[in-house]
């Protein structure tokens, strides 16, 4: 079952970040707020504390349209902001186990 | 050249402590994930703890809270305070460079592996 | 946690011959395996990252394959230097674990 003490690290949480992205690809950290000058990224929201699918579909690349809103445009990111590519040795049956626990 | 040295092996006696070190040169240190590795006499590798770049820290529990890893950025070093020291303790004890802090190479592909090691320090724990 | 299973834990060749290391997770690791080398005395070396990805410097004799639960390390053509024990490990969560290790010898 899962415990609010587990967390995803190392390929279980690029695998997991993988699916929930899909080809929209994602980011390990965010830019940094005005309010905070040091950005955090997603290995240390979820690789040291719990984290649930709502926090990593924060690090997805470009926000998935809604039914509602099909016409809004695809959030603009900065040119240097670090896009990385979907590993090729993702597989679906590994990400469920994973996305089980962060779903209970 | 890439290279780590531990030092700070030794003989100690049960209950006892010690504090390892492993000098780092040759790379940007404060962008890596640092590991110790120990591997008892005649036995495998058993995986001890790693930190972040930034002082993050994974622990295997057999060594929770009797060990400490840490790292001086500035120093280019990283640490292991041993407490209460058991006999099954006795290994050598390996550093070894891991990842980049997220994972990702320079070429934006996941790399989690240990590519760089120290040579190693004996730690002995007997009465 | 994750259990690797190496097997064979010891196996004799002779320089030339095909020789084929298995490592066995306890549950899917999607491709999230590592393969090193350690000969007496030393430090390991690590040979094979990500399942497949030969690290620098390296000889291509020397391959990586499998995803899920089921690895192998496979050396096409057995050279002296390769007499050596070797492990497997898992990247995909912690407690990061190895193999038990195979020992390979001289027949």
């Known amino acids: 079952a899962y415990r609010p003490s587990e967390t995803l690290c190392g390929g279980e949480l690029v695998d997991t970040l993988q699916f929930v992205c899909g080809d929209r690809g994602f980011y390990f950290s965010r830019p940094a707020s005005r309010v905070s000058r040091r950005s955090r990224g997603i290995v240390e929201e979820c690789c040291f504390r719990s984290c649930d699918l709502a926090l990593l579909e924060t690090y997805c690349a470009t926000p998935a349209k809604s039914e509602r809103d099909v016409s809004t445009p695809p959030t603009v990111l900065p040119d240097n902001f670090p896009r990385y590519p979907v590993g090729k040795f993702f597989q679906y049956d590994t990400w469920k186990q994973s996305t089980q626990r962060l779903r209970r | 050249e890439v290279q780590l040295l531990e030092s700070g092996g030794g003989l100690v006696q049960p209950g006892g402590s010690l504090r390892l070190s492993c000098a780092a040169s040759?790379?940007?240190?404060?962008?890596?994930?640092m590991i110790w590795v120990r591997q008892a006499p005649g036995k495998g590798l058993e995986w001890v703890s790693s930190?972040?770049?930034?002082?993050?820290?994974k622990y295997a529990d057999s060594v929770k809270g009797r060990f400490t890893i840490s790292r001086d950025n500035s120093k280019n070093t990283l640490y292991l305070q041993m407490n209460s020291l058991r006999a099954e303790d006795t290994a050598v004890y390996y550093c070894?460079?891991?990842?980049?802090?997220?994972?990702?190479?320079?070429?934006?592909?996941?790399?989690?592996?240990?590519?760089?090691w120290g040579q190693g320090t004996m730690v002995t724990v007997s009465s | 946690d994750i259990q690797m299973t190496q097997s064979p834990s010891s196996l004799s060749a002779s320089a030339g011959d095909r020789v084929t290391i298995t490592c066995r997770a306890s549950q899917s690791i999607s491709s999230y395996l590592n393969w090193y080398q350690q000969k007496p005395g030393k430090a390991p070396n690590l040979l094979i990252y990500t399942t497949s990805n030969l690290q620098g410097g390296v000889p291509s004799r020397f391959s990586g394959s499998g995803s899920g639960t089921d690895f192998t390390l496979t050396i096409s053509s057995l050279q002296p230097e390769d007499f050596a024990t070797y492990y497997c490990?898992?990247?995909?969560?912690?407690?990061?674990?190895f193999g038990g290790g195979t020992k390979v010898e001289i027949k």
């Open positions: 040759g790379f940007t240190f404060s962008r890596y994930w």
């Open positions: 070894a460079r891991g990842p980049l802090s997220d994972y990702y190479d320079s070429s934006g592909y996941y790399f989690d592996a240990f590519d760089i």
């Open positions: 930190i972040r770049s930034s002082g993050e820290t």
């Open positions: 490990q898992q990247g995909y969560s912690f407690p990061l674990t």
